[in-house]
Interface confidence: low
């Protein structure tokens, strides 16, 4: 069945409450500079609108802190009304490394993020960092690699490593949960002049996180004991018509071009999924395509397998696709597949469906295909173009979480954590945020607030209660830390 | 302390077989290769094959199959190897020894070595 | 197999000066941007220690006067300055294909 009733029941106490957020620019400079600046100065407001100093003046000063970014105020005013326990954010590859290798170190920038960080913690608020969340007008990588051919070029790979280590090296001890690339299987929509540009392009990611994987396991997991994983755009699919044989198998093929594409490699076997080498090599056989998945020498495929410590899947909607058979050589028509805009279903205003149940139908092929293993949902969440009263957000939340609850206590799915997609909305784009663009919050706030409190959906009588011993202690020594190392 | 704890000297007569053993510490057994590597006295370095404890598959040198048999015991982080129907040239000082981090199949950590000697 | 042919066989250096090792393969062990070509130094009674991997990777270490260079079939070691530890027997070993071999060793003395 699709839509079963809901359940009540709750999530376990070390559950992770998260919003997402993606990537955080740095301020350059601190923006309080009285408190380095030891002079008095006048304001010439009605003159040459000037500061003028005042000379035989002078003010106490203090050390810089956190706090004297006003980005991070925001960020942390923001937070504290999510009252999540997690935050997901991304680090700005080419502001912490211009150059694209370690010659030139921005370390204002790496102590921002530490200051993003440390701060949070304060507040009882972990962090999970993105290291690279390519955006689709813009791919985030340092302009040398970006005119180097980008992630067509194997040296981009060894690249991310370096960029990895050091983040790992500036804020492992204070982060416990990392993911390397956000949503790799879908820079198929930049690198999309041909399947094989596209299918090179996912190699060099791939081998990009595993690089920085094991980098992490060997060097920086014995004394941070952090996880590592990357993020999966992670979307279910059902046969746009259940009775039809040939949109059952598109369903699947989906399913493998989508999420098999990086989860076999790196989850699995160290090799592209059957399924799909298979299909692509049959088209090619028959001259629809000219497209082919690399094929992997026996080192890559030891380098790639098992290569996650958990399962990060950002899931937004269920897609309805039938087959269709497609000519081209581009990963799109390799896949042969057609997706249906089913118009009766409660959709939002950049047409994404509301199909609560694709969640859970998602966790058990990950478990199905994957095995039993630690699941976060780093990403799911709905526009919404209500300013403040966002009921479309509300009842997503709801529902959606309501699939993931019953995923956990039903299915048995090891889930342990929901990251709401995004903390706030950025001007002239989809209203995917909790906060307007000029730091309003919406009351799905409250209704996000009322989840995480109860942990779920509790019987009434139910406690909602947590030990200190069961709560989310991942990162105990880390506000000793935050006090002990300097910024 | 990574590095991996071989078995000790075996003296062994030919025709029998012998199996020697190297315990993992110090990282995630279940995660990386262990390879056997085979020295013969005075002589250079030959590779037997590798085994991957976390789904016990294995890979062989073609010379070496239905010599060497490699084994894994994810419960005591403990590999195997066993050499059957010896001869005098199967002694050898045998090394067990984990890949790297990168992929890259390079051997980083060394067992000390067990000397099997095949004598009647 | 891939053949791996180490070369000289053996060298003596006198300290301070430089020591270098050539390793040819029979064919490529270069793939994707890599090459799969690792450097290992043996002294008597131990087991080989890791030197250099990827062609020109300094392991954890190991000190910097150890250098790795090469791509394709033919990769070089070199030791510069030599210091009187590094009298040792080193061996090339390639991962680009099973089965993995190592070439037939240098032995490097210490006039």
């Known amino acids: 069945k699709e839509s079963t009733p809901d359940v009540q029941g709750q999530f376990p106490c070390d559950f992770s409450w998260g919003v997402t957020e993606s990537v955080l620019k740095p301020e350059s400079v601190a923006s309080s500079p009285q408190f380095s600046d030891p002079h008095l100065y006048v304001w010439n407001a009605t003159g040459n609108r000037l500061l003028h100093r005042v000379e035989g003046v002078r003010l106490k000063t203090r050390p810089a802190q956190c706090t004297d970014f006003v980005n991070i105020k925001k960020q942390l005013e923001m937070l504290a009304r999510m009252k999540v326990t997690h935050y997901r954010f991304a680090l700005d590859w080419a502001s912490v490394l211009p150059t694209g290798n370690l010659s030139a170190v921005n370390r204002q920038a790496l102590r921002y993020y530490r200051c993003v960080v440390s701060e949070g913690l304060k507040l009882g608020i972990s962090a999970m960092v993105t290291l690279y969340y390519p955006t689709h007008a813009h791919l985030g990588l340092p302009e040398p690699l970006l005119h180097a051919d980008g992630w067509l070029n194997p040296s981009t790979a060894e690249a991310f490593q370096a960029y990895a280590g050091l983040c790992f090296q500036e804020l492992g001890d204070l982060v416990k949960l990392w993911i390397t690339i956000n949503e790799p299987n879908r820079l198929s929509d930049i690198y999309n002049r041909s399947g094989n540009d596209t299918y090179g392009a996912a190699h060099n990611l791939l081998v990009a996180h595993a690089l920085a994987w094991r980098l992490y396991d060997r060097q920086f997991r014995p004394s941070q004991r952090g996880a590592v994983s990357l993020s999966l755009h992670a979307d279910w699919a059902e046969p746009a018509n259940p009775y039809a044989d040939s949109h059952w198998r598109a369903a699947e093929r989906f399913l493998q071009f989508e999420i098999a594409w990086f989860a076999e490699p790196l989850f699995k076997t160290g090799d592209y999924p059957a399924a799909m080498r298979e299909y692509i090599a049959s088209k090619h056989r028959r001259g629809l395509s000219s497209s082919a998945l690399p094929r992997l020498t026996e080192a890559e495929r030891r380098l790639l397998k098992g290569t996650v410590d958990f399962c990060a899947l950002n899931h937004f909607t269920t897609r309805f696709v039938m087959h269709e058979q497609l000519a081209g050589s581009r990963y799109d028509s390799d896949r042969d597949i057609q997706f249906l805009q089913d118009i009766t279903r409660l959709s939002s205003p950049t047409r994404l469906a509301v199909i609560p149940w694709g969640v859970r139908k998602l966790l058990r092929w990950v478990r199905r295909n994957y095995g039993d293993m630690d699941i976060y949902i780093t990403a799911s969440g709905i526009d919404d173009q209500a300013l403040e009263d966002d009921r479309l957000r509300k009842y997503y939340l709801g529902k959606y979480l309501q699939e993931v609850l019953k995923a956990y206590l039903i299915d048995k799915v090891r889930i342990k954590g929901y990251y709401a997609f995004k903390l706030a909305e950025e001007k002239s784009k989809p209203r995917f945020g909790f906060f307007t663009s000029d730091f309003k919050a919406k009351s799905s706030i409250q209704f996000y607030n009322k989840v995480i409190s109860s942990r779920g959906f509790p019987f009434e009588n139910s406690s909602s209660r947590c030990s200190q011993t069961q709560e989310n202690t991942e990162c105990t020594v880390c506000l000793f830390l935050v006090q002990k190392k300097p910024l | 302390q990574v590095q991996p704890q071989e078995s000790g000297p075996e003296l062994v007569k030919p025709g029998a077989l012998v199996k020697i053993s190297c315990k993992a510490s110090?990282?995630?057994?279940?995660?990386?290769?262990i390879n056997w590597v085979k020295q013969r006295p005075g002589q250079g370095l030959e590779w037997i094959g590798w085994?991957?404890?976390?789904?016990?598959?294995?890979k062989y040198n073609e010379k070496f199959k239905g010599k060497a048999t490699l084994t894994a015991d994810k419960s005591s982080s403990t590999a195997y190897m066993q050499l059957n129907s010896l001869t005098s040239e199967n002694s050898a000082v045998y090394f067990c020894?984990?890949?790297?981090?990168?992929?890259?199949?390079?051997?980083?950590?060394w067992g000390q070595g067990t000397l099997v000697t095949v004598s009647a | 197999d891939i053949v791996l042919t180490q070369s000289p066989a053996s060298l003596a250096v006198s300290l301070g000066q430089r020591a270098t090792i050539s390793c040819r393969a029979s064919?490529?062990?270069?793939?994707?941007?890599?090459?799969?070509m690792h450097w290992y130094q043996q002294k008597p009674g131990q087991p080989p220690k890791l030197l250099i991997y990827?062609?020109?990777n300094l392991e954890s270490g190991v000190p910097a006067r150890f250098s790795g260079s090469g791509s394709g079939t033919d990769f070089t070691l070199n030791i510069h300055p030599v210091e009187e530890e590094d009298a040792a027997t080193y061996y090339c070993?390639?991962?680009?294909?099973?089965?993995?071999?190592f070439g037939g060793g240098t032995k490097v003395e210490i006039k």
């Open positions: 085994i991957y404890p976390g789904d016990i598959s294995t």
């Open positions: 110090g990282y995630t057994f279940t995660r990386y290769d």
């Open positions: 990827l062609a020109s």
């Open positions: 064919k490529s062990v270069s793939t994707s941007g890599y090459s799969y």
């Open positions: 070993q390639h991962s680009r294909e099973l089965p993995y071999t």
């Open positions: 020894a984990r890949s790297d981090y990168y992929g890259s199949r390079s051997f980083v950590y």
